[in-house]
Interface confidence: medium
């Protein structure tokens, strides 16, 4: 039975040229996290494997940094980075938990961080 919940940074906005941290946190379960995948739509950004470490997709290597923790830092943001991001937690014995973050990259300097929220 899957009892865990994923808390994410929710809907967030950031300035063009800036950076942002995508963060998910799995709670309310004792399952072992074997791997976390970070994906944008159908593209794999990065994986953090419990045993094999972090691996960033080559096409994102210049602008994506691992961490903090199991999160992901996006740098040199462009308007094209606007969209949905998913953290996919593979766990044993529970299975797979998925969190969603929507990032909006703004031209102006009035970008504000959205509130945190939980995905059941």
């Amino acid at each position: 039975m899957m009892t865990g919940t994923i808390e994410t940074t929710g809907n967030i906005s950031a300035e063009k040229g800036g950076s942002i941290i995508l963060q998910c946190h799995l709670s309310s379960t004792t399952a072992q996290v074997t791997q976390v995948n970070w994906e944008q739509q159908d593209q794999l950004l990065a994986i953090c494997n419990a045993d094999l470490g972090w691996h960033i997709s080559p096409s994102f290597k210049d602008r994506v940094a691992p961490g903090p923790g199991l999160g992901l830092t996006l740098q040199s943001l462009t308007v094209n980075d606007t969209g949905e991001y998913f953290c996919i937690y593979h766990t044993y014995p529970d299975g797979t938990y998925t969190g969603r973050i929507f990032l909006e990259v703004l031209e102006s300097s009035v970008a504000e961080h959205g509130a945190r929220f939980q995905i059941p």
Epitope: T34, Q35, N49, A50, D51, L52, H90, T91, P93
Partner: nanobody, 120 residues
């Protein structure tokens, strides 16, 4: 210590197929993950595919550049991982390494690599 030995590399024409094997021996406890990585001449080692415990089974993750062409699987009874590579391209030319989680969580063991050359 775990020993990993890759085999199956060689010279193949574009569009061809190869199947790589990675045999593990030594002090193997419960395995969480086995992965394949590659390093082309003059480039960094990059992630290719990984198979990871999740829920009641295993999940696979692929680099975008090989998705739909490569398949990773593992035979737990033989402590062996495989990488089936189809529709090979010249840019797949590299030394292919396998990695496996070791007894110590957070570390991994690596093989010596097998060379795959895709050329006419």
């Amino acid at each position: 210590e775990v020993q990993l030995v890759e085999s199956g590399g060689g010279l193949v024409q574009p569009g061809g197929s190869l199947r790589l094997s990675c045999a593990a021996s030594g002090r193997i406890f419960r395995r969480n993950s086995m992965g394949w990585f590659r390093q082309a001449p003059g480039k960094e080692r990059e992630f290719v595919a990984v198979i990871t415990r999740s829920g009641g089974g295993e999940v696979t993750t692929y680099a975008d550049s090989v998705k739909g062409r490569f398949t990773i699987n593992a035979d737990n009874s033989k402590n062996t991982a495989y990488l089936q590579m189809n529709s090979l391209k010249p840019e797949d030319t590299a030394v292919y390494y396998c990695a496996m989680s070791s007894v110590t969580r957070g570390s991994s063991d690596w093989g010596q690599g097998t060379l795959v050359t895709v050329s006419t």
